[in-house]
């Protein structure tokens, strides 16, 4: 196993809407074809996988039907879309990549990107 | 995945044994090869990149088995030389096809059996 | 290269019983795991992928379950077409590796 840089942006707000988006970028050594990335969250001192794809350069990443996760490939950059995001989800979302083909098999965690999610007021009722 | 049909080789011969692609674009999915000998399992062989065409194999049959693949007919090639009578298996090309985190092989050929026998 | 072990080697069941068919890897390879079913002169046709999630066009009669270095898959009630061979496959690390398979025939 080789280690690989991954860097990801420090602070991220979710939407009104409960969606946080940011860019996982890894530096590949070589010329790796297919790709796997995991998000995983960190909250109090616990981890938790929250999507992971395997895809092949070029292709669409595609997460399991029931992910809270999408995504879209570019070069050696990642842009993931978490949705149905609320308070309580606000944590340390890490990215993991790891360059499964051709060999060697390299693996890169990245320092983690601070979620905040803050829950919409609810409306007041009208008067009107 | 329409496989080429059934071959007798004698030992010392060699077998090459196409793989035709349809109904996908050919350039987005790995293949691989797989054989199976006579009440066996399934062994790995290898893999080839139908973009580039970048291969690799199995350690077991390095320097005798040779992939290839031909993008104007969409068509894949496993190649193995050297034959001798512990070869004698079905040969499968297979997709491979990822969902979520987890890869799998989806759709296969019929399979190519191939008898080493003098 | 990950060995895959999968017991038993052969079983004998009856249509209706309920079947219980083992994997396990020699590290653990998460939930990265596939199932297959062969039936005599045919391609292996998949069943189950990433240790649970059920391929498309199979009966639900089929599940999974596991991750780490046990899975299992069973069958709640048997059918006649069930009678095959069935084998395990990781797909955590290069290269894929299968078990060496379980029969499943009538008792």
């Known amino acids: 196993c080789k280690a690989m840089h991954v860097a990801q942006p420090a602070v991220v707000l979710a939407s009104s809407r409960g969606i946080a988006s940011f860019v996982c970028e890894y530096a590949s050594p070589g010329k790796a074809t297919e790709v796997r990335v995991t998000v995983l969250r960190q909250a109090d001192s616990q981890v938790t996988e929250v999507c992971a794809a395997t895809y092949m350069m070029g292709n669409e990443l595609t997460f399991l039907d029931d992910s809270i996760c999408t995504g879209t490939s570019s070069g050696n950059q990642v842009n993931l879309t978490i949705q149905g995001l609320r308070a309580m989800d606000t944590g340390l979302y890490i990215c993991k990549v790891e360059l499964m083909y051709p060999p060697p098999y390299y693996l890169g965690i990245g320092n983690g990107t601070q979620i905040y999610v803050i829950d919409p007021e609810p409306c007041p009722d009208s008067d009107f | 995945l329409v496989q080429s049909g059934a071959e007798v080789k004698k030992p010392g011969a060699s077998v090459k044994v196409s793989c035709e692609a349809s109904g996908y674009t050919f350039t987005n999915y790995y293949i691989h090869w797989l054989r199976q000998a006579p009440g066996q399992g399934l062994e790995w062989m290898g893999i080839?990149?139908?973009?580039?065409?970048?291969?690799t194999y199995a350690q077991k049959f390095q320097g005798r088995i040779t992939m290839t693949r031909d993008t104007s007919t969409n068509t894949l090639y496993m190649e193995l030389s050297s034959l001798r009578s512990e070869d004698t298996a079905i040969y499968y090309c297979?997709?491979?096809?990822?969902?979520?985190?987890?890869?799998?092989?989806?759709?296969w050929g019929q399979g190519t059996t191939v008898t080493v026998s003098s | 290269s990950i060995v895959m072990t999968q017991s038993p080697s052969s079983l004998s069941a009856s249509v209706g019983d309920r079947v219980t068919i083992t994997c396990r890897a020699s590290q653990s390879i998460s939930s990265y795991l596939n199932w297959y079913q062969q039936k005599p002169g045919k391609a292996p046709k998949l069943l189950i992928y990433?240790?649970?999630s059920l391929q498309s066009g199979v009966p639900p009669r089929f599940s999974g379950s596991g991750s780490g270095t046990e899975f299992t898959l069973t069958i709640s009630s048997l059918q006649p077409e069930d009678f095959a061979t069935y084998y395990c496959?990781?797909?955590?690390?290069?290269?894929?590796?299968f078990g060496q398979g379980t029969k499943v025939d009538i008792k």
């Open positions: 297979a997709r491979r096809d990822c969902r979520g985190p987890s890869c799998y092989f989806a759709y």
């Open positions: 496959q990781q797909a955590n690390s290069f290269p894929p590796t």
């Open positions: 080839i990149n139908p973009s580039g065409g970048s291969t």
């Open positions: 990433a240790a649970s």
